[in-house]
């Protein structure tokens, strides 16, 4: 159910592309394709290629992305395209000009002097942004989200975008300076992962990150369980980055117990993050427990 045909506007297309990219990534990282047959992988790659091709129709001359060709470009959507395309680089041919042009736009057009990334054209499909929706810690959450995307594109774009390392540092400075004031577990988790990627989740910040966990196994706010799955996935990635393998097992157990296999309305971020985090876990954690995740691969009929 994760392999779907992407279609629609620049936002819907990314909603459609997400599950296929993350499913292929997960099965590649965990070496599970023999369960499904390698021909299924080929079919999935064709769908990713379609999604990529379609997304280019929503790329603007500035290299940013929008829902429609004449709509103002979105910071969040452009950062998300960067994130998904960075993961897909190992799967299909992606033009580095497309990816790094988007990175450049984010830095030059949307980053303020204090390091914050601003959104001037919010996405239409608010359900696709996950826990960032109605987040009263928006500057921190969006800056963390964009920063994570930039870091995932770093190896690909460092040579083409001279301002990338400085931009990452500036955004990290902002997150670090404001981290201790955060109230929402979601923002603690996403900003925690962004800082952990930079090796800056330390001391009191690390303490806050760890103590925010409920029962030492989940990062949870009142409200949608989908957002808690997403937040806990960010937190798991942070823990893996920190190599805190004592804290990891209960978190993985909790994620596994949610029996969350992705798909469905509003699931874009939770789907992407849970599979990214669990793939990373199976790759990084020594003697990791085998996860029995139900990834069903039904290729859409042509």
């Amino acid at each position: 159910h994760l392999i779907v045909t992407p279609s629609g506007c620049g936002e819907q297309n990314m909603i459609g592309m997400t599950p296929t990219v993350i499913a292929v990534h997960y099965l590649d990282e965990t070496e599970q394709w023999e369960k499904f047959g390698l021909e299924k992988r080929q079919g999935a790659l064709e769908l990713i290629k379609k999604g990529y091709t379609q997304q280019l129709a929503f790329r603007q001359p500035s290299s940013a992305f929008a829902a429609f060709v004449k709509r103002a470009p979105s910071t969040w959507l452009t950062a998300y395209v960067v994130k998904v395309f960075s993961l897909a680089v190992n799967l299909i041919a992606i033009d580095s000009q497309v990816l790094c042009g988007a990175v450049k736009w984010l830095i030059l057009e949307k980053q303020k002097p204090d390091g914050v990334f601003q959104e001037d054209a919010p996405v239409i499909h608010q359900e696709m942004i996950g826990g960032l929706r109605n987040n009263n810690e928006k500057d921190m959450a969006l800056t963390a989200f964009v920063l994570i995307s930039l870091q995932e594109a770093k190896d690909i774009c460092e040579e083409q975008v001279n301002s990338l390392p400085g931009s990452i540092t500036k955004a990290g400075d902002f997150l670090e300076a404001n981290y201790m004031n955060l109230q929402r577990s979601y923002t603690v988790a996403i900003a925690g992962y962004a800082l952990a990627q930079m090796g800056r989740l330390k001391g009191p910040l690390l303490n806050k990150f760890l103590t925010t966990a409920k029962d030492k196994n989940r990062w949870e706010d009142p409200g949608k369980q989908l957002y808690n799955v997403e937040a806990t996935s960010y937190a798991l990635l942070a823990l893996l980055q920190l190599k805190d393998f004592d804290f990891v097992p209960p978190v993985v157990r909790w994620l596994n117990e949610q029996r969350y296999y992705g798909g469905g309305y509003g699931s874009t971020q939770a789907t992407f993050m849970v599979f990214q985090a669990l793939a990373q876990y199976q790759k990084d954690a020594p003697d990791h427990q085998e996860l029995n995740l139900d990834v069903s691969l039904q290729l859409p009929s042509r």
Epitope: G8, K49, Q54, Q60, F68, V69
Partner: antibody
Framework: QSVEESGGRLVTPGTPLTLTCTVS????????MSWVRQAPGKGLEWIGI?????ITYYASWAKGRFTISKTSTTVDLKITSPTTEDTATYFC?????????????????WGPGTLVTISS | VLTQPQSVSGSLGQTVSMSCKCD????????VHWYQQHPGKAPTTVIY?????PSGVPDRFSGSIDSTSNSASLTITGLLAEDEADYYC??????????FGGGTQLTVTG
């Protein structure tokens, strides 16, 4: 920079027919190419498109009836099982710009067209 | 679907406009392009991206979008005999979906 279609002829219904569009002065690794047709006395009708990464899309009515493929210098349109309704002049057109600057998604270089007649 | 009037006419030197109505979706979201086609010839672009003229196309040709009527318009001023042709609008809804209007026949009278 130009494109030219060839392969149009009279065929009987059900006989597969392949039209070829030969491009010169530009590379198919930098441009998407589209096929458009025009029945006698009728309007233009978009059939489908092929992108530099070989991804193809078709108009909903054209799916299954046409196949677009390419080599380094040609783009083919195969009419899988022609009917009399497929009688038309078939044009090949270049889509400006790849990868995807949205402001340039239109057809800017057209071939003169090739006439296909389907009749028993 | 893009709907165009079947025919319009104008006298030499006059101004004519023709419309291209978007029946589904919001025209503000998509670019509209206009093509001129003389009998037996291939189409040529006269306007792209709503209101842009390719080089070589005289400034007598202009394009516009009207959000309230959800339609695009092609206007030709100072009509010449050579402007007599069929005109088609095209919209690229996304990279996998292009739609032509039915076409408008322009007749130029003396």
């Amino acid at each position: 920079q130009s494109v030219e279609e060839s392969g149009g002829r009279l065929v009987t219904p059900g006989t597969p027919l392949t039209l070829t569009c030969t491009v010169s002065g530009f590379s198919l690794s930098s441009y998407a190419m589209s096929w458009v047709r025009q029945a006698p006395g009728k309007g233009l009708e978009w059939i489908g498109i092929i992108y530099p990464n070989d991804i193809t899309y078709y108009a909903s009515w054209a799916k299954g009836r046409f196949t677009i493929s390419k080599t380094s210098t040609t783009v083919d349109l195969k009419i899988t099982s022609p009917t009399t309704e497929d009688t038309a002049t078939y044009f090949c057109a270049r889509v400006v710009s790849w990868p995807g600057y949205t402001t340039e998604y239109y057809f800017n270089i057209w071939g003169p067209g090739t006439l296909v007649t389907i009749s028993s | 679907v893009l709907t165009q009037p079947q025919s319009v006419s104008g006298s030499l030197g006059q101004t004519v406009s023709m419309s291209c109505k978007c029946d589904s979706g919001n025209i503000d979201n998509y670019y509209v392009h206009w093509y001129q086609q003389h009998p037996g010839k291939a189409p040529t672009t006269v306007i792209y991206n709503d209101d842009q003229r390719p080089s070589g196309v005289p400034d007598r040709f202009s394009g516009s979008i009207d959000s309230t009527s959800n339609s695009a318009s092609l206007t030709i001023t100072g009509l010449l005999a050579e402007d007599e042709a069929d005109y088609y609008c095209l919209s690229s809804v996304s990279s996998d979906n292009y739609v032509f209007g039915g076409g408008t026949q322009l007749t130029v009278t003396g």
